[in-house]
Interface confidence: low
C-alpha cells in the first residue's frame, strides 16, 4: 500500500485527481497532489 | 523572485557534524514541503529527508542511510529549512540540494536551490 | 524500498529526432512518477509530475506516459538544449528513490 505522506494525504481526501493522486474537494490549497521533487 | 539558497557546506572529518541551511524567498514557505535531496560526485540523486508543511504538522521522514544522524527541521517564521548532519561518513559527501513542493490540486509549485557541497574526508 | 531501472543508460540521438527513455519499478506505483532534467553543475529541473503531467513551462515536446510499473518520458522533435542526463523518482512508498538516470549525448 501506498504509505508515502502524500498518499495518507489521498486516501483522506478520496478524489481522483490528473496529478495522478487525488484533491479535496474545495478551493483550499492543499499538498494532496502527486509529490514530486 | 523565488529563491532558495542552501549553505553550510564544507569539508568535515569523518564523525563530524554540518548544519547545512536553506533560506527561501518569494513564495509562502510554511505551505511547502521541503525535502533535501543529495548527489554524490558523478553519482544518481538520492533523497535524504523530507519536512511537511506547518499545516501537516512538520511531520518528518527519513532514508534509512541517514536515520538516526541527521535531523531536518524548518523555522517558518525565518524561511529557513535546516538539516543537522551529525555521525557524518566518506559516504555523505556530496551535493545537498533543496526542494520546495506544493500542490494546488489543478498544479504544483516545485522549486530547487543551486546545492551545497559537502566533503567527508581525514 | 522500490528500485527504479532506467533504459537506455545513455542515448545517442541527433537534433530533431524523437527520443524515448524508459523507467521501471520494482514494484507497482501506480501514477507517483516523476522525470527530471539535470546538466552538468546545475539543480535538477522537474519537467513531468503524476507520470504525464507537464510543469509550468516545461515545452510540449516533453511527454510522459504509464502506470504501475512502466513509464516512458518521450522528447518529440529534440532541441540542441535537451542533452542533459534524465531521472525517474517514484513517491509511491518511503524512501522515494530515484532511477539511476539515462544520459542523453548527441550522436
Known amino acids: 500500500a501506498c504509505d508515502t505522506a502524500t498518499c495518507v494525504t489521498h486516501r483522506l481526501a478520496g478524489l481522483l485527481s490528473r496529478s495522478g493522486g487525488v484533491v479535496k474537494n474545495n478551493f483550499v490549497p492543499t499538498n494532496v497532489g502527486s509529490k514530486a521533487f | 523572485e523565488v529563491q532558495l539558497v542552501e549553505s553550510g557546506g564544507g569539508l568535515v572529518q569523518p564523525g563530524g557534524s554540518l548544519r547545512l541551511s536553506c533560506a527561501a524567498s518569494?513564495?509562502?514557505?510554511?505551505?511547502?514541503?521541503i525535502s533535501w535531496v543529495r548527489q554524490a560526485p558523478g553519482k544518481g540523486l538520492e533523497w535524504v529527508a523530507e519536512?511537511?508543511?506547518?499545516?501537516?504538522?512538520?511531520?518528518?521522514h527519513y532514508a534509512e542511510a541517514v536515520k538516526g544522524r541527521f535531523t531536518i527541521s524548518r523555522d517558518n517564521a525565518k524561511n529557513s529549512l535546516y538539516l543537522q548532519m551529525n555521525s557524518l561518513r566518506a559516504e555523505d559527501t556530496a551535493v545537498y540540494y533543496c526542494?520546495?513542493?506544493?500542490?494546488?490540486?489543478?498544479?504544483?509549485?516545485?522549486?530547487w536551490g543551486q546545492g551545497t557541497l559537502v566533503t567527508v574526508s581525514s | 524500498e522500490i528500485v527504479l531501472t532506467q533504459s537506455p543508460a545513455t542515448l545517442s540521438l541527433s537534433p530533431g529526432e524523437r527520443a524515448t527513455l524508459s523507467c521501471k519499478a520494482s514494484?507497482?506505483?501506480?501514477?507517483?512518477v516523476s522525470w527530471y532534467q539535470q546538466k552538468p553543475g546545475q539543480a535538477p529541473r522537474l519537467l513531468i509530475y503524476?507520470?504525464?503531467n507537464r510543469y509550468l513551462g516545461i515545452p510540449a515536446r516533453f511527454s510522459g506516459s504509464g502506470s504501475g510499473t512502466d513509464f516512458t518520458l518521450t522528447i518529440s522533435s529534440l532541441e540542441p538544449e535537451d542533452f542533459a542526463v534524465y531521472y525517474c523518482?517514484?513517491?509511491?512508498?518511503?524512501?522515494?528513490?530515484f532511477g539511476q538516470g539515462t544520459k542523453l549525448e548527441i550522436k
Open positions: 526542494n520546495a513542493y506544493f500542490d494546488y490540486g489543478l498544479a504544483i509549485q516545485n522549486y
Open positions: 518569494g513564495f509562502t514557505f510554511s505551505n511547502y514541503w
Open positions: 519536512i511537511r508543511s506547518e499545516s501537516d504538522a512538520s511531520a518528518t
Open positions: 514494484k507497482r506505483v501506480t501514477t507517483y
Open positions: 503524476g507520470a504525464s
Open positions: 523518482s517514484q513517491s509511491y512508498n518511503y524512501p522515494y528513490t
